[in-house]
Every structure is written in C-alpha cells, then in structure tokens.
Amino acid sequence: EAIQVTQPSVVLASSHGVASFPCEYSPSHNTDEVRVTVLRQTNDQMTEVCATTFTEKNTVGFLDYPFCSGTFNESRVNLTIQGLRAVDTGLYLCKVELMYPPPYFVGMGNGTQIYVIDPEPCPDSD
Amino acid sequence: EAIQVTQPSVVLASSHGVASFPCEYSPSHNTDEVRVTVLRQTNDQMTEVCATTFTEKNTVGFLDYPFCSGTFNESRVNLTIQGLRAVDTGLYLCKVELMYPPPYFVGMGNGTQIYVIDPEPCPDSD
C-alpha cells in the first residue's frame, strides 16, 4: 500500500530567494516517526537537498540544514527553502516515509517547480 | 486548414517586471498583414492586453500600448510585456490572424504562464 503525496505544481520564490510550499500525504496513518526528504530533479538525476525526521515531540525539522526548514502537523509538512538563486530554479520533489511503527510506507510527490528570479542590486547610496 | 501558433509554456518576468517570449506560427504564408493579439486568461474569461498589425514595412508593433512591444520577422513575433507586477501573474495567450490577402487564417497558442515577483524595495539611503 503506497501513500499519496501531494505538493503544489508551481511556487515562486520571493525576491529574497525564499520558497515555501506544503507537502501532504494520505491516507493519514498513526505514525510515530515520519521522514521527509526534499530532492531536486535535474534531467534524470535526483539530488538530495535536505531531509529530516519528525516525531510527535519534534515537529520542527531540518535543524542540520541551513537552507531548509519545516513544520509538521498531522499529515502535512510546511516546507521552506531559502537562499535560492535563479540557478536553483527547478523541480523539487517531496518524499515521505512512514518509518515507525511498521508497516513501512513510502510515497513521492510529482514535484514543485520553483522559479527563482535574482533581484536587481540596489543602487549604491552616495 | 488552421495555422499552428506556438509559444513557450512558462516565462519568468525579470525583477523589473519585464517578460519576453516568442510567438511563432506555421505554416508560413505570404501575408501582407499579420495581426497579433496578446490575451490574458483568468478563469474562463479572456482579456485583451494589447494588439497590433504587422506589415512588411511595419515590423515594430504595439506603438499604441505602453506595456507591450514586439518585433516581427517572417513567421515569428518577439513579444515583450513590461510594467508587470505580481498580481499580473497569469496565462498570456498569443493569437495570430493572417489578415490580408485572403484567405483569412486564425490561430491561438496554448498560452505562456508568466510568473512575476515584486522586488523588495531598496532601503532608503541616509
């Protein structure tokens, strides 16, 4: 039995290079540990951007990753990626694993296309 | 016999609010006048953004429209929309009409999703 993972198809990063989007899964299971991984797809290659494990007590994740943050609530993770630049424009996939207790479930979203535009530099102040 | 109009599926506006994209049609006909209309689709409604008629002599268009400009070369129009803000994010369709001489042909592209991010204001200089 697979879980369905849904995420928005498109997100625009702010002018500060911050993109936020939800990653939800269903059906909701009574799970002690949920692992969420953000992957970037370029051509046929997947690169891990960041990963974290959420628990009932630990609902704030990605503490080891300076570019990612996230909060967990029931079957929804609110993901934020920061420090993005135009070269980071691409498809970001959310992978969800229900780690414990068994049975183990895994699901992958179709990806969120994140568009990033580099801001123009502000003029120097005289 | 219809003409096929092609345009990119996605374009990002620059931080200055400028989006440029090509609109091409085929097959190419020996046409004295080609009318190009840019439409914005919101829900089921189409709104005309700008329109112009290109001729062999008049290859620069949209002179009456402050937000649009375009150049025509054979069966390709290079469109530029400026003054865009985040609220203008949406689907922009290119409509091409071969106006004269007959036969009249018309075609519509599938639309270009233009994403616009408002820039952060620069800090006041002291």
């Epitope: - | 016999e1 219809a2 004295d32 006048e33 008629t53 001729t55 008049n58 409509k95 009409e97 106006m99 004269y100 001489p101 007959p102 036969p103 009249y104 042909f105 018309v106 075609g107």
Partner: antibody
Framework: EVQLVESGGGLVQPGGSLRLSCAAS????????MHWVRQAPGKGLEWVSG????????SYADSVKGRFTISRDNSKNTLYLQMNSLRAEDTAVYYC?????????????????WGQGTLVTVSS | DIQMTQSPSSLSASVGDRVTITCQAS??????LNWYQQKPGKAPKLLIY???NLETGVPSRFSGSGSGTDFTFTISSLQPEDIATYYC?????????FGQGTKVEIK
C-alpha cells in the same frame, strides 16, 4: 442589420473617370476586409479589387491594375473605387462585398454580404 | 489563377425535381469551394461554404459535396423561388475565382 449600399455609377466616355462609393452599416467596418466584384451584362462574376481592414494592404485583378484604386475611410464606414482610363470592357454592375473573418471558423474564403450593385456604363 | 468550370451552363427542370450542378477546379482546392445564388436583378447570396456547409438561414433542400477538384451542388426538390443563376467560387488560392454560372429555369 448588416448592409452595404453602393453609389456613384453612371454613363462615362472611354478614357474617362468615375468614383464609386460603398456605405457600410451594421458591423465593425474597420475590422473587415472589403472588396469590389463586377458583373458585365449577361456574364459571370469577376473579382476586381480588395483592401484590408486597416486600409494598409490592397490588391487588384490584372485587368484593372494601374487604372483602378481602392481605398476606404473607416471614420465614415465607406469603401471607394476610383476608376480611371475606363474602357468599354469595364461596363458592368459593380458590387461591394464584405469578406468574412471569423475567429470561430479558423479559415474563411467567401464573401458573406453584398451590396445591391451600381451600374457603370462606358460608352461613347 | 485557378480556373473554375461549371456545368451545365443552363438547365430547365420541373418543380419538385432534383437538380444537380457540377463545378471543376483546374487544380486541387481541398474543400474550399463556395456556392452563391443570384436572382435576376439582385446581388449574389452565399448558400454553401467550404463545399458542404449550409449558410445560416438557407433552406435544407440545398446541399453541396466534393473535395479536391470535383464538386457538386444539389437542390433536392426544386421550388419556384429557386429560379436563379448559381455560381461556384474557389477559396483556396487568392485571388478568388468564380465559375461562369448555371442558369436554372422552371419547365
């Protein structure tokens, strides 16, 4: 009601000139390509000249090229045909006709509205 | 220019008869063939466009068929008000050209 009304026909000597007018109503004239089609007595239909909606492009049948000039005044919803160096073989009923351009149809190739015609007779 | 040849040039039929007119193009014009009706002293009127499409308001006894170079126009049951000259017109290549016309009379 969509309507086209021609005027300006009459009797003229060979080598003379005449100007035909066609007043349009009931549709967006400036968006419509307009044409002149003639019919000699007891004969068939012959396309003569056409003009684009903007007035920027024109075309002529070989038989009238260099002698006839088509024009339009979109502010007056009127089509014109200036006929110079007229010949006996130009004798005909001259019809103005609208060439239909419809987005729904993708391609069109017919005249959907015609005026009642005006007779031009070239004779000495 | 594309030449259009219509036949017959004239015909006489009785009320209720089926009437058929043919039109041949000098080259392939796909389905870009239109038919007009012209009553004496009147302007032409579009009846059929693109070979087989009936113009709005035209009675269903009129029909058209064909593609390529050979086309047919049919009046399924001739009525007195159908006395007129019928013209075909090609719309494939500019300039448009017309057939020489077929005059339809009642016996």
């Amino acid at each position: 009601e969509v309507q086209l009304v021609e005027s300006g026909g009459g009797l003229v000597q060979p080598g003379g000139s005449l100007r035909l007018s066609c007043a349009a109503s009931g549709f967006t004239f400036s968006s419509s390509s307009m044409h002149w089609v003639r019919q000699a007595p007891g004969k068939g239909l012959e396309w003569v000249s056409g003009i684009s909606g903007s007035g920027g492009s024109t075309s002529y049948a070989d038989s009238v090229k260099g002698r006839f000039t088509i024009s339009r005044d979109n502010s007056k919803n009127t089509l014109y045909l200036q006929m110079n160096s007229l010949r006996a073989e130009d004798t005909a009923v001259y019809y103005c006709a609208r060439y239909l351009m419809s987005f729904n149809l993708v391609r069109t190739s017919w005249f959907d509205v015609w005026g009642q015609g005006t007779l031009v007779t070239v004779s000495s | 220019d594309i030449q259009m040849t219509q036949s017959p040039s004239s015909l006489s039929a009785s009320v209720g008869d089926r009437v058929t007119i043919t039109c041949q193009a000098s080259q392939d014009i796909s389905n870009y063939l239109n038919w007009y009706q012209q009553k004496p002293g009147k302007a032409p009127k579009l009846l059929i466009y693109d070979a087989s499409n009936l113009e709005t308001g035209v009675p269903s006894r009129f029909s058209g068929s064909g593609s390529g170079t050979d086309f047919t126009f049919t009046i399924s049951s001739l009525q007195p008000e159908d006395i007129a000259t019928y013209y075909c017109q090609q719309g494939d290549a500019w300039p448009w050209t017309f057939g020489q016309g077929t005059k339809v009379e009642i016996k």
